[in-house]
């Protein structure tokens, strides 16, 4: 059963992780990029299922993909290069799903703009905060 | 509701410069758009040629990238083509168009009516 | 330079279902967008991001993607559906845009 010191380290981390991603949609949000709509036309692919940490799976296969849409972003309303922002994100969704877990990730027929992706992945870390707290 | 209407001559002689202007009514040029020039050649299909962003930053298609040149100016609400350098080939009907806001799909929402552009001496 | 490949022609009975295709190395990830041409007209959108109906579109009209295919699909073809047909897509990155080169459709 997991231990009070373990869920509240798994609150910060999902709190960290719902940081960054807001971080990134404020990002690109900035209606001052030309950029954003050429972003729009990059297709993310969407978990079928993201209830559980083990469905971060789903999100971190499309990291690599984010990255390269961040990189042709040529913000600079990032604080870390799109590269190091990637990898933080990376180790906090490794640590929350677990690195030994072996779940095959499910994605919908419908893919997404960055941006529902974004949205959709940060609604995920809001909801598994709630049931935390 | 955008609008859009091109204007400039309709014959331009070989080797000389082809020059069209869109007119942006209904909305401002300086939203979160990029503004589009496309041609279509008699009986031929749809071929984009560049864009600009109110900021003046541009993309071009690589094919014609040497020869165009496409400028904004926002004080008039409109934006511009020059094509240098025009054969025959050139001879088409070019259409201005246009994407809606950020936030809604990309693409063109908004088309001109298009101006047919004769390329002959 | 980048290309999206689409059949010239496509002919159907009306009431029947067409089904146009287009082709490109970047729709994995790269959104498709369809224009409707009628003679003498200006194109007008009727599909954006792969799937989804702008609005005034007619439900018969629809899009899926798959791997590097996008497929423009019109249920019950009417003859007002007589038109150009072109997919619309951008590179992988980003900054270049390009349409297929068209398909013409043919309600007999």
């Known amino acids: 059963a997991p231990t009070s010191s373990s869920t509240k380290k798994t609150q910060l981390q999902l709190e960290h992780l719902l940081l960054d991603l807001q971080m990134i949609l404020n990002g690109i949000n900035n209606y001052k990029n030309p950029k954003l709509t050429r972003m729009l036309t990059f297709k993310f692919y969407m978990p079928k299922k993201a209830t559980e940490l083990k469905h971060l799976q789903c999100l971190e296969e499309e990291l690599k993909p984010l990255e390269e849409v961040l990189n042709l972003a040529q913000s600079k309303n990032f604080h870390l290069r799109p590269r190091d922002l990637i990898s933080n994100i990376n180790v906090i969704v490794l640590e929350l799903k677990g690195s030994e877990t072996t779940f095959m990730c499910e994605y919908a027929d419908e893919t997404a703009t960055i941006v529902e992706f974004l949205n959709r992945w940060i609604t995920f870390c809001q909801s598994i905060i709630s049931t935390l707290t | 509701q955008v609008q859009l209407q091109e204007s400039g001559p309709g014959l331009v002689k070989p080797s000389g410069t082809l020059s069209l202007t869109c007119a942006v009514s209904?909305?401002?040029?300086?939203?979160?758009?990029?503004w589009s020039w496309v041609r279509q050649p008699p009986g031929k299909g749809l071929e984009w040629i560049g864009e600009i962003y109110h900021s003046g930053s541009t993309n071009y298609n690589p094919s014609l990238k040497s020869r165009v040149t496409i400028s904004v100016d926002k004080s008039k609400n409109q934006f511009s083509l020059k094509l240098s350098s025009v054969t025959a080939a050139d001879t088409a009907v070019y259409y201005c168009a246009s994407g809606t806001e950020v936030g809604a799909p990309h693409g063109f929402d908004y088309w001109g009516r298009g101006t047919l552009v004769t390329v002959s001496s | 330079s980048y290309e999206l490949t689409q059949p010239p022609s496509v002919s159907v009975s009306p009431g029947q279902t067409a089904r146009i295709t287009c082709s490109g190395d970047a729709l994995p990830r790269k959104f498709a967008y369809w224009y409707q041409q009628k003679s003498g007209q200006a194109p007008v959108m009727v599909i954006y991001?792969?799937?989804k109906r702008p609005p005034g579109i007619p439900e018969r009209f629809s899009g899926s993607s798959s791997g590097t295919m996008a497929t423009l699909t019109i249920t019950g073809a009417q003859v007002e559906d007589e038109a150009d047909y072109y997919c619309y897509s951008t590179d992988s990155g980003g900054d270049v845009s390009v349409f297929g080169g068209g398909t013409k459709l043919t309600v007999l």
């Open positions: 209904g909305g401002s040029i300086s939203s979160s758009n990029w």
């Open positions: 991001e792969d799937s």
